[in-house]
C-alpha cells in the first residue's frame, strides 16, 4: 500500500530524505523539486544543496536537519492545499546515471473546523473570505530571512503521519535513505 505524508493547512510539512556521506563533510549535491523526479535534475526546484551548503531555496522551504550529516529532509512552512502533490528528493551522486531519486507524496488536509459534520472540500462554506480558492490562493511572499526559529520538536510531525501505513516510530526509517561510499 502506498506511503504518503500528511500535514494540515497552516502547519509545517516534513518530507524525510537521507543519505550517509562517505566521509564527514564529503557532501553530495541534493535537489528538491515539485512533481515527480525527471530523468535528470529536479523539476520546479524549490531547494538545492552543493558540496558545501544550501545554495538555492525558495520561500517556505528549508532543511531543518543537519544536512552535513546527510539529513536532507524538507520542511515546508505553513502549508496550503496547493502544496499537495509529489515531491522529488534527488541525491546527485557523481557518475553517469548514479543519482538516487525518491518520489514522496504529500497530502494536505483542511484545518479542523468545528463543528464539521462532513469533510470540508468546497471552501466557500467553511471559509467565506477564501471564496473558492481551495488552497490555490496567491503565492506567499515571505522571505526566508523573516521565518521564525523553529526546531524539530515544534514541527508537527504527528500531522505528517504515514498515510495508509504504520506511523513510523523513527522518521529516519520511514524516509528515503541511502548510503554512499
Amino acid at each position: 500500500s502506498e506511503v504518503e505524508y500528511r500535514a494540515e493547512v497552516g502547519q509545517n510539512a516534513y518530507l524525510p530524505c537521507f543519505y550517509t556521506p562517505a566521509a564527514p563533510g564529503n557532501l553530495v549535491p541534493v535537489c528538491w523539486g515539485k512533481g515527480a523526479c525527471p530523468v535528470f535534475e529536479c523539476g520546479n526546484v524549490v531547494l538545492r544543496t552543493d558540496e558545501r551548503d544550501v545554495n538555492y531555496w525558495t520561500s517556505r522551504y528549508w532543511l531543518n536537519g543537519d544536512f552535513r550529516k546527510g539529513d536532507v529532509s524538507l520542511t515546508i512552512e505553513n502549508v496550503t492545499l496547493a502544496d499537495s502533490g509529489i515531491y522529488c528528493c534527488r541525491i546527485q551522486i557523481p557518475g553517469i546515471m548514479n543519482d538516487e531519486k525518491f518520489n514522496l507524496k504529500l497530502v494536505i488536509k483542511p484545518a479542523k473546523v468545528t463543528p464539521a459534520p462532513t469533510r470540508q472540500r468546497d471552501f466557500t462554506a467553511a471559509f467565506p473570505r477564501m471564496l473558492t480558492t481551495r488552497g490555490h490562493g496567491p503565492a506567499e511572499t515571505q522571505t526566508l530571512g523573516s521565518l521564525p526559529d523553529i526546531n524539530l520538536t515544534q514541527i508537527s510531525t504527528l500531522a505528517n503521519e504515514l498515510r495508509d501505513s504504520r506511523l513510523a516510530n523513527d522518521l529516519r526509517d520511514s524516509g528515503a535513505t541511502i548510503r554512499i561510499g
Epitope: 520546479n44 497530502v107 481551495r134
Partner: antibody, heavy 119, light 107 residues
C-alpha cells in the same frame, strides 16, 4: 497498488434504474473521497459528484442533481452509484476515480462501465 | 461553473514533432489545472497537476505551464504511443470541469 474495479456493462430500458459498484483496494478506503464521472460518446468528461466513505458526506454536480445517488460500504471498500429514470441521453461510460487527497485531480480511475439506455 | 475551452480539437502530427495544446479557463484558476491522456477504450491517465507538476511515471517529454486563465500542454517529441485524446481539467473549485479534448493523430 491502488485499484478501482467497476462492475460490468449495463443495457437498460428508458425509465429504468441501474446501480453500479466500484471496489477499491490498495489503500484505506475511508481516507479518500470517491468521485464519479461520466463521458457521453464523443463528449468531454463530466463530474457527477463524490462521496466521503468516512462520514457519508456527499456532494453532487448541481447540473445533474437527482440523476445519481451515491452510497458506500466501508466493510467491502465499495462505492456505489445508482442512476434513476434513465433516458437515452444518459448513455455513457461511467467512471469512479480517487483524488490525491483533498485536491480534485485524479491519479486513480476505474476502468469505466458502459451504460446503454435503449428500448 | 468554470468553463475550460481547449484548442485545437484535433491535430495531426509526425513522430518527433513538438506539439502544443492550449486551454483557457473562463475565470482565474491560479495554477489549478491538470492534464490527462485518454486512449480509446481506456480510462484517463493523469499526466500533469497544478499546471506544471508531472505525476509519477510520466515521461519528461510531457510538460505543462501557465497560470490564471491560460494554460499550455506540450509534448516535446511525439512518440507513436502518444496517440490519444488529451484533456485539461480545472481543480480550483467544485465542480471540477474538463476541456473538450484534443485528439492527437499521427500523419
Amino acid at each position: 497498488e491502488v485499484q478501482l474495479v467497476l462492475s460490468g456493462a449495463e443495457v437498460v430500458k428508458p425509465g429504468a434504474s441501474v446501480k453500479m459498484s466500484c471496489k477499491a483496494s490498495g489503500y484505506t478506503f475511508t481516507n479518500y473521497v470517491m468521485h464519479w464521472m461520466r463521458q457521453k460518446p464523443g463528449q468531454r468528461l463530466e463530474w457527477i459528484g463524490y462521496i466521503d466513505p468516512d462520514n457519508d458526506g456527499i456532494k453532487y454536480n448541481e447540473k445533474i442533481k437527482g440523476k445519481a445517488t451515491l452510497t458506500s460500504d466501508k466493510s467491502s471498500s465499495t462505492a456505489y452509484m445508482e442512476l434513476s429514470s434513465l433516458r437515452s441521453e444518459d448513455s455513457a461510460v461511467y467512471y469512479c476515480a480517487r483524488d490525491f487527497g483533498y485536491v480534485d485531480w485524479f491519479p486513480y480511475w476505474g476502468q469505466g462501465t458502459t451504460v446503454t439506455v435503449s428500448s | 461553473d468554470i468553463v475550460m475551452t481547449q484548442s485545437p480539437s484535433s491535430m495531426s502530427t509526425s513522430v518527433g514533432d513538438r506539439v502544443t495544446i492550449t486551454c483557457k479557463a473562463s475565470q482565474d484558476v491560479t495554477t489549478a489545472v491538470a492534464w490527462y491522456q485518454q486512449k480509446p477504450g481506456k480510462s484517463p491517465k493523469l499526466l500533469i497537476y497544478s499546471a506544471s507538476n508531472r505525476y509519477i511515471g510520466v515521461p519528461d517529454r510531457f510538460t505543462g505551464s501557465g497560470s490564471g486563465t491560460d494554460f499550455t500542454f506540450t509534448i516535446s517529441s511525439v512518440q507513436p504511443e502518444d496517440i490519444a485524446v488529451y484533456y485539461c481539467q480545472q481543480h480550483y473549485s467544485i465542480p471540477p470541469t474538463f476541456g473538450g479534448g484534443t485528439n492527437l493523430e499521427i500523419k
